[in-house]
């Protein structure tokens, strides 16, 4: 980790040793409200690779709630509606950070927890050509 | 929030309103192992609308690196390397929760944040506003 | 029940033609990708020709492109194959096959298959 | 085209025994694998895609794993019907492709 120059204004906290225990304030600051994030509410169904999205619910992970991409076909889609099968829809994964209440349904207590989520969907050439 | 049943063995606390504070775990348990992620390291090359990835650094955020996509074109790439204008890349954007530390530089304490990130890009049909 | 049921093999020349049937129950065709698979005797599958649900998309290996056509009559829920300019490598049983999708990627139900000689 | 080489071509096994069957892509084809099994003068059957997902009706004995180019079929204890010709098929890049197939004959 980066060494941090300690703050004297800083709650104090007696174990420096990994796995850490941190105090974590859960009054969520929203930094997108300063932002404008694209709408990509509903690119799920334009897309050339589109997804559905299905809801993954929890209430021992905080958010309890995490929406999972689905692509909804194998192959992409052309600008008739049909099928492309010389092009792949795979999904966009990323790894996020949650939260687990650790031990179990405790309110006040967790641990950091790393997923894996799809976000969306991609349209892509199955094959790299390689080049001599 | 969801009402926990109580567990007699969780840590206690005193603070029952919100803004809460928590008691967190920072040795991060990893899920993915038990799985078998799709590798999608080069679906930003290999995409109809591919992606380059920016480093975006922070040492005040926990985790303090985070990967952002660009989209490379406006349009979608053709399957002879041309781009398509007829089409849209856009990114697709995902709100994630990061730590911050509060105070700053605090080695011990943070604050949830939601910020939103771009994991990749979809190359979409774009809207066609029609003139009565 | 799903069943598949093949029809319009036999023996043909080199340089002909013929065209399978397939006759589809138990399922809405409409909604589902067709395949044709064949099979060699004593060999191992290969893929003739795949049909999307509507009819819309197509895809033929280079060992039959520009001689099979792979067709579908929904209103009818028949698949075809026409075969021109048969070889004697063409000699197989066929199958039609259905995706469990709208699109012809992998196979959940087979029909018994077609016996195709080419043979002079 | 992909090619998919399986391998052992044949094996003898006995019931109750454990049979590993695997398929290696000559590229990385995103777990977009499927199982078949045939039995003589039969039309194939589906036992598993996306590499890991069982079949309805398909017995808990048979099992896919692997990733990237490396494919396994796994039955966990051998049974009387389990002897076939099996087949596996990738279908991330047309043309889809099939592997040679591995007999599975009673020693």
């Known amino acids: 980790g980066i060494a941090i120059p300690r703050n004297s204004g800083c709650p104090n906290s007696e174990d420096k040793n990994f796995p850490r225990t941190v105090m974590v304030n859960l009054n969520i600051h929203n930094r997108n409200t300063s932002t404008n994030p694209k709408r990509s509410s509903d690119y799920y169904n334009r897309s050339t690779s589109p997804w559905n999205l299905h809801r993954n619910e929890d209430p021992e992970r905080y958010p309890s709630v995490i929406w999972e991409a689905k692509c909804r076909h194998l192959g992409c889609v052309k600008a008739d509606g049909n099928v492309d099968y010389h092009m792949n829809s795979v999904p966009i994964q990323q790894e996020i950070l949650v939260l687990r209440r650790e031990p179990r349904h405790c309110p006040n207590s967790f641990r950091l927890e790393k997923i894996l989520v799809s976000v969306g969907c991609t349209c892509v050439t199955p094959i790299v050509h390689h080049v001599a | 929030g969801i009402a926990i049943p109580r567990n007699s063995g969780c840590p206690n606390s005193e603070d029952k309103n919100f803004p809460r504070t928590v008691m967190v775990n920072l040795n991060i348990h990893n899920r993915n192992t038990s799985t078998n992620p799709k590798r999608s390291s080069d679906y930003y090359n290999r995409s109809t609308s591919p992606w380059n990835l920016h480093r975006n650094e922070d040492p005040e955020r926990y985790p303090s690196v985070i990967w952002e996509a660009k989209c490379r074109h406006l349009g979608c790439v053709k399957a002879d390397g041309n781009v398509d204008y007829h089409m849209n890349s856009v990114p697709i954007q995902q709100e994630i929760l990061v730590l911050r530390r509060e105070p700053r530089h605090c080695p011990n304490s943070f604050r949830l944040e939601k910020i939103l990130v771009s994991v990749g890009c979809t190359c979409v049909t774009p809207i066609v506003h029609h003139v009565a | 029940e799903v069943q598949l049921v093949e029809s319009g093999g036999g023996v043909v020349q080199p340089g002909r033609s013929l065209r399978l049937s397939c006759a589809a129950s138990?399922?809405?065709?409409?909604?589902?990708?067709m395949s044709w698979v064949r099979q060699a005797p004593g060999k191992g599958l290969e893929l003739v020709a795949i049909?999307?649900?509507?009819?819309?998309?197509?895809f033929y290996p280079d060992s039959v492109k520009g001689r099979f056509t792979i067709s579908r009559d929904n209103s009818k829920n028949t698949l075809y194959l026409q075969m021109n300019s048969l070889r004697a490598e063409d000699t197989a049983v066929y199958y039609c096959?259905?995706?469990?999708?709208?699109?012809?990627?992998?196979?959940?139900?087979w029909g018994q298959g077609t016996l195709v000689t080419v043979s002079s | 085209d992909i090619q998919m080489t399986q391998s052992p071509s044949s094996l003898s096994a006995s019931v109750g025994d454990r049979v590993t069957i695997t398929c290696r892509a000559s590229e990385d084809i995103y777990d977009r694998l499927a199982w078949y099994q045939q039995k003589p003068g039969k039309a194939p059957n589906l036992l598993v895609s996306g590499a890991t997902s069982l079949e309805s009706g398909v017995p808990s004995r048979f099992s896919g794993s692997g990733s990237g180019k490396d494919y396994t079929l796994t039955i966990s204890s051998l049974q009387p019907e389990d002897f076939a010709t099996y087949y596996c098929q990738q279908y991330w890049s047309v043309p889809w492709t099939f592997g040679g197939g591995t007999k599975v004959e009673i020693k």
């Open positions: 096959a259905r995706d469990p999708r709208h699109d012809g990627y992998f196979f959940d139900y």
């Open positions: 138990g399922f809405t065709f409409s909604t589902y990708g």
């Open positions: 049909i999307n649900h509507n009819g819309g998309s197509t």
